[in-house]
Interface confidence: low
Amino acid sequence: CRTSECCFQDPPYSDADSGSASGPRDLSCYRISSAGYECSWQYEGPTAGVSHFLRCCLSSGRCCYFATGSATRLQFSDQAGVSVLHTVTLWVESWARNRTEKSPEVTLQLYKSVKYKPPLGDIKVSKLAGQLRMEWETPDNQVGAEVQFRHRTPSSSWKLGDCGPQDDDTESCLCPLEMNVAQEFQLRRRRLGSQGSSWSKWSSPVCVPPENPPQPQVRFSVEQLGRDGRRRLTLKEQPTQLELPEGCQGPAPGVEVTYQLQLHMLSCPCKAKATRTLPLEKMPYLSGAAYNVAVISSNRFGPGPNQTWHIPADTHTEPVALNISVGTNGTTMYWPARAQSTTYCIEWQPVGQEGSLATCNLTAPQDPDPAGMATYSWSRESGAMGQEKCYHITIFASAHPKKLTLWSTVLSTYHFGGNASAAGTPHHVSVKNHSLDSVSVDWAPSLLSTCPGVLKEYVVRCRDEDSNQVSEHPVQPTETQVTLSDLRAGVAYTVQVRADTAWLRGAWSQPQRFSIKVQVSD
């Protein structure tokens, strides 16, 4: 027999045994030109001393063989004795070490068996109703294909799936999407309606992340508020390493996870921008405000579930930093100014109502006044802090108010609203004899004492009605009792108490009249 022809004789070896794990496999045959054909196959196992024979049986029942030696690819023409227009059955027999191994058979019409290409170029991946959708452009002149996919995870072997028939310029496939593990996909194609024809090679790997991006293990901590009114948010984390299937461990775009930090400043709701997203490792400086912080993990399918933490407001207060002057036209606050052209946010909230939304006002950018102070004024009609109750006031500052991470806390303090002078007047002043020349004066705490740092002192005034002589006694804001001594028996006195703030003298309580009885000796 000539080497270019299929030899219609018995092959020069004994019968084949197809039960071996090694041997020839993955035989594919197809037309490569108008009159040229090619068959190729894989050989598993040691190749030394192996001789391959491509066997062919015609529909008439006559069989022939090509001897290819150690080669696993053979080209032949339509003149080689193999019918190309009719169905033929082909297989490979490999002879080695006195035994013969046989490949699975393929039955096909060679002329119609065109070598199909796998999906080439960009395979678009998207999520559709909980499944994975892959889409690609049909290779040139190859419309009409059957498509299969295979997929594996880092811990599983390949599983085969069917994409169904395709008959368009673009082809697509719906595949399973894993929730928590990455997958590697490959696709292959063959001519539609020719069951015996050969499959294309597998496509390049398509690497698909899990539907849920892996969450990093994150712990936040926040430093003390510095003198500049800012505190550093720090993070301790361990990124979650997602194991990848074998074919995705080289350059395999598509499985990346991006982590971002989302900051939401809860305080000062009247400012321009409350939320900012920034890279996870850019640990920002924060003001003393309350924040919600979220870590967002995203992959090619979009963001996954958030992890959210609450960072409470820094409650440290400086009671002396704020001056408040109440006049007939309204109220003005003064505080040490920051740099030129600073915007301030003044926020206030009744104490005990911390759960409700605070009221706030944003100033226009202002420069320090000649005394180095910044100011904010409001009229009585505005109703701001008009009720006679304790308010928590926080002032924030920023030279760039639209940049969330550039706000700082200027001060945090308390203020008693409304007519503090009258509202703070101590009530229930009572006088009790203490000794022959002294009395004990008691009163109920001023409403101002509910407001931390606001009540500077009580003043107790005692007037001798005979001589009109007046004495005043300062009392610590934590005390509600004082002893008046060196009093004279039989003289009428009046006593009054007032409560003072740092910037305001209180109103005297109603005068309380008393006298010490003259002791009559027996």
């Epitope: 892996p214 395999a252 990346e256 982590y259 490792e281």
Partner: nanobody
Framework: QVQLVESGGGLVQPGGSLRLSCIAS????????MKWVRRPPGKGLEWVSV????????KYSDAVRGRFTISRDNAKNTLYLQMNSLKPEDTAVYYC????????????????RGQGTQVTVSS
């Protein structure tokens, strides 16, 4: 074409030191966060350390913190890993990896990676 070439691995006794280098080409090195990852024998990939594009943000896994130091020289397109107080459990193939952005946390998956350099810690 991204290329990452690691060197500096070898056999070292417990307690010893090694310095790994990784020369990068095919992309603007100074624009990307870089990482070291490793694959111990018979195990999956482990994250070791990461440094962002400009260098100020550096992070380490708990297993190496205090013993390993990551650094980069953007002028030389080179990433380094100084490994001190090595332990047998540090035995692995060490890979240099490029993230998909300048941010140290832009990716926990290493889409571009070198061929690796073997580090063996044994007495």
């Amino acid at each position: 074409q991204v290329q990452l070439v690691e060197s500096g691995g070898g056999l070292v006794q417990p307690g010893g030191s090694l310095r790994l280098s990784c020369i990068a080409s095919g992309f603007t090195f100074s624009d990307y966060a870089m990482k070291w990852v490793r694959r111990p024998p018979g195990k999956g990939l482990e994250w070791v350390s990461v440094i962002d594009s400009e260098g100020p943000t550096i992070k380490y896994s708990d297993a190496v913190r205090g013993r390993f130091t990551i650094s980069r020289d953007n002028a030389k397109n080179t990433l380094y890993l100084q490994m001190n107080s090595l332990k047998p459990e540090d035995t692995a193939v060490y890979y240099c990896a490029k993230s998909n952005g300048g941010s140290a946390f832009s990716s926990v998956l290493y889409t571009d990676r070198g061929q690796g350099t073997q580090v063996t810690v044994s007495s």
